[in-house]
């Protein structure tokens, strides 16, 4: 089976603009690429299947997405702990200043869209 987690965080050193609503824009693609690479680094251990339903909102930039793991390989607490532990490296490697991290269980990935 698969476990899904809804993750929300702020990138306080970036500014939202309307191009972050469109996946064909440079800004969207660059930020999505950095975030995707970052999560591959954070959850290197077996069990991480990927991320989906990425959405950007105003508030500097608020990022909302769904993470997928093989069932039983990680829990909500560990998802949040590992992400928080990576904040310093995210700043140095990707120039992303991360704050206000929130993680919750979701029954299926599309919940992130509501």
């Amino acid at each position: 089976g698969v476990s899904f987690f809804f993750l929300s965080f702020h990138i306080s050193n970036l500014q939202f603009n309307s191009s972050l609503e469109d996946p064909s824009t440079d800004y969207y693609q660059e930020l999505q690429r950095d975030i995707s690479e970052m999560f591959l680094q954070i959850y290197k251990q077996g069990g991480f299947l990927g991320l989906s339903n990425i959405k950007f909102r105003p508030g500097s930039v608020v990022v909302q997405l769904t993470l997928a793991f093989r069932e039983g390989t990680i829990n909500v607490h560990d998802v949040e702990t590992q992400f928080n532990q990576y904040k310093t490296e995210a700043a140095s490697r990707y120039n992303l200043t991360i704050s206000d991290v929130s993680v919750s269980d979701v029954p299926f990935p599309f919940s992130a869209q509501s």
Epitope: S18, E21, D22, S24, R57
Partner: antibody, heavy 117, light 107 residues
Framework: EVQLVQSGAEVVKPGASVKMSCKTS????????INWVRQRPGQGLEWIGY????????EYNEKFKGRVTLTSDTSASTAYMELSSLRSEDTAVYYC??????????WGQGTLVTVSS | DIQLTQSPSSLSASVGDRVTITCRAS??????LNWLQQKPGKAIKRLIY???SLDSGVPSRFSGSRSGSDYTLTISSLQPEDFATYYC?????????FGGGTKVEIK
């Protein structure tokens, strides 16, 4: 089915203001952007600005800055555009267009504003 | 501001004809271009997004492509319901801008 329903036609006097609405329905996202565009009689399309529904985040075309105010009400899924200091050349159909995974995905039917003394 | 030069401004064609409309961008806009259809008294409809992606429910006779700074909307076999005005729209940078429009009329 996604729908954008705009408020009805307005006739206003030069120098006055007009406020129109754009109500959206039929989509699962509760947060998204609304762009506003106008079309003067017999002319092409002109971008006015953008608001992210439920936030105070806005972008404006410099041409309209100072005369246009974009606001929204998340609970009513409605965006508003107010245009002030109206002149005859503001006579136009004003459209809202909402994002749906990408920009300008769905369009309203338009609100005709006639500026006349 | 980025200028979009759309041509032709109008054209006459018959049902079944292949129709091509072009937009030239004054600056690099990547793939950030949409094609819109406007019919009198109806809401504007997006046909193509991101240069070449067909919107849901849009017939496959519509297609979009790019060659350098030239962007093309093609209608492979014009149908009666396709007589309308078409606009290109760039959203690479603000202010977002539109082409001048192409009115497709019945020959």
């Amino acid at each position: 089915e996604v729908q954008l329903v705009q408020s009805g036609a307005e006739v206003v006097k030069p120098g006055a203001s007009v406020k129109m609405s754009c109500k959206t329905s039929g989509y699962t996202f509760t947060s998204y952007g609304i762009n506003w565009v106008r079309q003067r009689p017999g002319q092409g399309l002109e971008w006015i600005g953008y608001i992210y529904l439920g936030s105070d985040y806005t972008e404006y075309n410099e041409k309209f800055k100072g005369r246009v105010t974009l606001t929204s009400d998340t609970s009513a899924s409605t965006a508003y555009m107010e245009l002030s200091s109206l002149r005859s050349e503001d006579t136009a159909v004003y459209y809202c267009a909402r994002s749906a995974g990408s920009l300008f995905g769905y369009w309203g039917q338009g609100t005709l504003v006639t500026v006349s003394s | 501001d980025i200028q979009l030069t759309q041509s032709p401004s109008s054209l006459s064609a018959s049902v079944g004809d292949r129709v091509t409309i072009t937009c030239r961008a004054s600056q690099d806009i990547g793939i950030t271009l949409n094609w819109l259809q406007q019919k009198p008294g109806k809401a504007i409809k997006r046909l193509i997004y991101a240069t070449s992606s067909l919107d849901s429910g849009v017939p496959s006779r519509f297609s979009g492509s790019r060659s350098g700074s030239d962007y093309t909307l093609t209608i492979s076999s014009l149908q009666p319901e396709d007589f309308a005005t078409y606009y290109c729209l760039q959203y690479a940078s603000s202010p977002y801008t539109f082409g001048g429009g192409t009115k497709v009329e019945i020959k």
